[in-house]
């Protein structure tokens, strides 16, 4: 077909403009409003219900096929009879002090039903009882302070640990690995109360007795934990309970700041050990085990009945069918289920994606469907795992590789309303910022300049001058898959706050009760511009994938993203040069590699200038090189104990889900390698990884070359 | 009444290890719940801190002497000691025993303190 | 680190005069502040703790004021027995602990 009937005779940056002047920020309101009316927890009727209608709307918006795809995978609860609570226990054994059993809900919802207290998801069941031992973050680090400088055991006690910094999954096995025999987190006001704003209602901080709940879970990437490979559908086989993915092994509760006053104010033991370790409660913040003085023989005792169910769950699928690639895939994606209401996670991402569909809707209705096939997916049960994202990719997953161009995230649009965040492969950065330069900025005092402007000057790059920051892809969203599995480009933006002056873990509200519609309106975004920024950064990008002629992908940035990679690592392991000389570890090989890459894919770019865009054959072969890229840097055997975390370039940080770690299979075997018992093994590793590393850059360099 | 004497050479060679000793009279260690630490004070910068312990043998050390610096406790014989090694003519100076205000107050404001020992560092 | 910056370095009054000394952090410190009198030849004397309360057997006429990163030592009818130098110190953020150069108050 010649390629104007694809477009209606609209020329590409035409029908652009007309699918972007087609976003409304009042539609956007609208969205979230029916989207945050109950709450939608997944594996829940509610959830059914706004599949359904997510499905009915989306087939009126235009889409060609729209599918509710489900599954039954592993999901946790709370027993509604028998609640979850902690208590402080005198030495006759009697409750002194017990935690709250729920939040206070919102003005306005106090009637809304179906609230799910806060509980830490897939908790086991346990009522241990013993002394107390404050963790800080229970990150890596805290625990190698404590134990390592402070001599400070945590076997056979319950350590308490605040939110932030890392995914609340690491922090849980961080405990396990130290001996603890259960878990408290909490929300500390130096992390989830910004000072000078007010608590919710009146402002948009955290209550005293606000709660975050959250999975915690270690999966890796497996999906979900009963079938670690393949999809939960009727034929699944399921492992038992016993050798499920992930599980943790000791009990674990989230509590809010005004019942942790009262677990940690009279904690005994030696102080903190330096003032990073000081929250903002008015407590010593002693590091225990155990209380002081006069408290010393008080207890604490935790009580958790959450079970786990085999739960069915729904993800929407929409496709929109391409025009001239209808075997190439340009996919949108973000949840649905949320803890409570959902009013900015996942709701306000939510919101976006429908208005987008909405948009390519209506431009279809007028006879201009995209170049590619772009499919939109509402997905279920992100909160306990990335469970339907996954689920639905390892069951389409011999497709996705073969024709997955792109995968574009779309959960909370908002964090914050200070600048835009993005975080994307590095084929994907001049993408990002050439279609920022051609939006306007909502920022205040930027009127009339480009988001590209207003971005660069509020998040410049560390690296480059004049250019705004891009981030790594770690994971603790539905791109995990995607990227770190499959291999298919991936990115995600949205609006987050100013990270210099505001020190907050996420947003104080962050899956809590007080996570809602007004709490958007009235604080957040009220007129909705931000969103509207977010639904045309994220329907341009999807746009741009699905209708360029040529895949608007850059391998020169992954070049120049590679080099800055393989000097990191390189300069970590240069801490230990006496090692490095007795064992022989050299980066020459990855270095050539990476000058190798670097040369292909400057060729390649000559070759893209000078291609005959006329030629559907050479056009499709550069394409497809383009295309693969990023899936030349998957290894079929995965990472080290991580099978599903297969990309060599990039994968979410051991020590932090959220956070990607570039190398990883390399920094981790140089991880904490000084404290190694065998250290001949543990360089042979890193020799084996270098190895790795350098042989995956190669053979990504190859797949640029010159096909013939 | 708590009490703190600190003890050792006055005279130190450059590049070996210095050690003081800080006697406690009148509390235990391990009871008291207050946390025992070193300052020194020299004419050029001042008063120092050092670094502090804890009975549990949590310790806290200045960033700028941690890779030279041990304390230890003695509980048995009440005795704290400070163990500085590859000294040289910078840590000479007065050096203080001290008590940081307490009990269960944790690295807070220093309310008791020895008279103090000088440390030459020469050859 | 913390620096703490004392001023006036020396401050030279007569007995039965006030003295106010200051004492500035260079980020909060909160209220975790101290003031320590030293005469010579002796260990330091804590005066006052929590940026205003007294040490025990401290005289009234010592006071501090003062949060976050201004300090105020005041001492409001000086005693002969009062001059020596005086020295602030944080304990909100450490390691490492840190002290001012120190006030020295001379008999005019």
């Known amino acids: 077909k010649p390629s104007n009937e694809a477009t209606g005779n609209v020329s590409h940056s035409g029908m652009k403009k007309e699918f972007l002047h087609e976003l409304k920020a009042e539609n956007i309101k609208k969205f979230l409003y029916n989207f945050t009316r109950t709450p939608h927890l997944a594996g829940t009727q509610n959830n059914f219900e706004l599949a359904k209608q997510i499905h009915d709307q989306w087939k009126e918006f235009g889409l060609d096929l729209v599918e509710l795809s489900h599954y039954d995978v592993l999901l946790s609860y709370p027993n509604k009879t028998h609640p979850n609570y902690i208590s402080i226990i005198n030495e006759d054994g009697n409750e002194i002090f017990k935690t709250s059993l729920s939040e206070q809900p919102p003005p306005g919802y106090e009637n809304i039903s179906d609230v799910v207290p806060p509980y830490s998801a897939f908790s086991p069941q346990g009522t241990p009882e013993g002394d107390l031992v404050y963790v800080n973050y229970a990150r890596t680090e805290d625990f190698f302070k404590l134990e390592r400088e402070m001599k400070i055991s945590c076997s056979g006690k319950i350590v308490i640990a605040r939110y932030g910094k890392v995914f609340r999954g690491n922090m849980v096995k961080n405990a396990q690995l130290a001996g603890a025999k259960g878990m408290i987190l909490y929300s500390d006001p130096a992390d989830y109360f910004v000072p000078a704003v007010k608590s919710y209602p009146d402002g948009w901080n955290l209550p005293g007795g606000g709660v975050q709940r959250g999975n915690v879970l270690n999966l890796n990437g497996a999906g979900d934990p009963l079938t670690p490979g393949y999809p939960a559908n009727e034929h699944a086989y399921r492992h038992e309970l016993t050798n499920a993915v992930g599980l943790p092994s000791i009990p674990v509760h989230p509590i809010g700041y005004d019942d942790a006053q009262k677990l940690l104010e009279h904690m005994g033991g030696p102080a903190p050990p330096d003032s990073s370790w000081k929250g903002g409660l008015k407590v010593p913040y002693n590091v225990g085990p155990g209380f002081a003085g006069n408290f010393s023989t008080q207890k604490v005792k935790m009580h958790i009945h959450s079970y786990t169910k085999v739960t069915r769950i729904y993800n929407v699928i929409g496709t929109l069918k391409g025009a001239l690639e209808p075997d190439r895939y340009v996919i949108l994606g973000g949840h649905r289920d949320a803890w409570v209401f959902g009013g900015i996670d996942p709701q306000s991402g939510a919101a976006v994606v429908h208005e987008i569909v909405r948009s390519f809707g209506t431009l279809k209705k007028k006879g201009r469907r995209p170049r590619r096939t772009i499919l939109f997916a509402s997905w279920d049960a992100e909160e306990f795992g990335l469970l339907g994202s996954t689920e639905w990719a390892e069951e389409h997953s011999r497709l996705l590789q073969e024709r997955g161009v792109a995968y574009i995230n779309a959960d909370s649009s908002i964090e914050g309303n200070y600048t835009l965040r993005v975080d994307c492969t590095p084929l994907m950065y001049s993408l990002v910022y050439n279609l920022t330069k051609e939006l306007q900025s909502p920022d205040e005092g930027f009127e009339g300049k480009s988001l590209y402007d207003s971005w660069k000057e509020k998040s410049p790059s560390p690296e480059f001058i004049g250019m705004p920051r891009i981030s790594k892809l770690g994971s603790g969203n539905d791109f995990e898959v995607f990227f770190q599995r499959l291999g298919i480009a991936s990115g995600r933006a949205r609006y987050t706050k100013n990270w210099k002056t505001n020190k907050v873990s996420s947003y104080p509200l962050y899956h809590s009760v007080y996570e809602t519609y007004e709490l958007v309106v009235k604080f957040y975004d009220p007129t909705f511009k931000y969103h509207l920024t977010v639904a045309q950064v994220r329907g341009a990008m999807v746009f741009e994938l699905a209708n360029s002629i040529v895949l608007p992908f850059d391998c020169q940035s992954y070049a120049v993203a590679l080099k800055k990679y393989a000097d990191t690592i390189y300069n970590i392991s240069m801490k230990h040069p006496q090692e490095m000389k007795a064992y022989m570890i050299s980066f020459d090989s990855l270095f050539s590699a990476v000058n190798n890459f670097t040369d292909v894919a400057s060729k390649f770019n000559q070759r893209l200038q000078e291609l005959d865009k006329s030629n559907p054959i050479l056009l499709r072969i550069m394409n497809d090189q383009l295309m693969y890229l990023e899936r030349a840097f998957i290894d079929p055997l995965g990472l080290p104990g991580r099978p599903f975390y297969r990309h060599i370039i990039y994968a979410p940080s051991s020590h932090n889900k959220y956070a990607g770690e570039s190398f990883p299979g390399i920094y981790d075997a140089l991880f904490d390698i000084s404290s190694k018992v065998n250290a001949s093994k543990a360089w042979n590793e890193v020799k084996r990884q270098i190895s790795i590393a350098t042989f995956t850059v190669q053979a990504a360099a190859e797949t640029l070359r010159e096909v013939a | 009444q708590v009490q703190l004497q600190e003890s050792g050479p006055g005279l130190v060679k450059p590049s070996v290890t210095l050690s003081l000793t800080c006697t406690v009279s009148g509390a235990s260690f391990s009871s008291s719940g207050y946390y025992w630490g070193w300052i020194r004070q020299t004419p050029g910068k001042g008063l120092e801190w050092i670094g502090t312990m804890f009975y549990s043998g949590a310790t806290y050390y200045n960033p700028s002497l941690k890779s030279r610096l041990t304390l230890n406790m003695d509980t048995s014989k009440q005795e704290f000691t400070l163990r500085l090694t590859s000294v040289t003519a910078e840590d000479s100076a007065v050096y203080y025993c001290v008590r940081h205000r307490g009990p269960d107050t944790g690295l807070d404001a220093f309310d008791l303190w020895g008279q103090g020992t000088q440390v030459t560092v020469s050859s | 680190d913390v620096e703490m910056t004392q001023s006036p370095a020396s401050l030279s009054l007569s007995p039965g005069e006030r003295a106010t000394l200051s004492c500035r952090a260079s980020?909060?410190?909160?209220?975790?502040l101290a003031w320590y009198q030293q005469k010579p030849g002796q260990a330091p004397r804590l005066l006052i703790y929590?940026?205003?309360t007294r040490a025990t057997g401290i005289p009234a006429r010592f006071s501090g004021s003062g949060s976050g990163t201004e300090f105020t030592l005041a001492i409001s009818s000086l005693q002969s027995e009062d001059f020596a130098v005086y020295y602030c110190q944080q304990y909100n953020n450490w390691p490492p602990l840190t002290f001012g150069g120190g006030t020295k108050l001379e008999i005019k």
């Open positions: 929590g940026a205003s």
């Open positions: 980020q909060s410190v909160s209220s975790d």
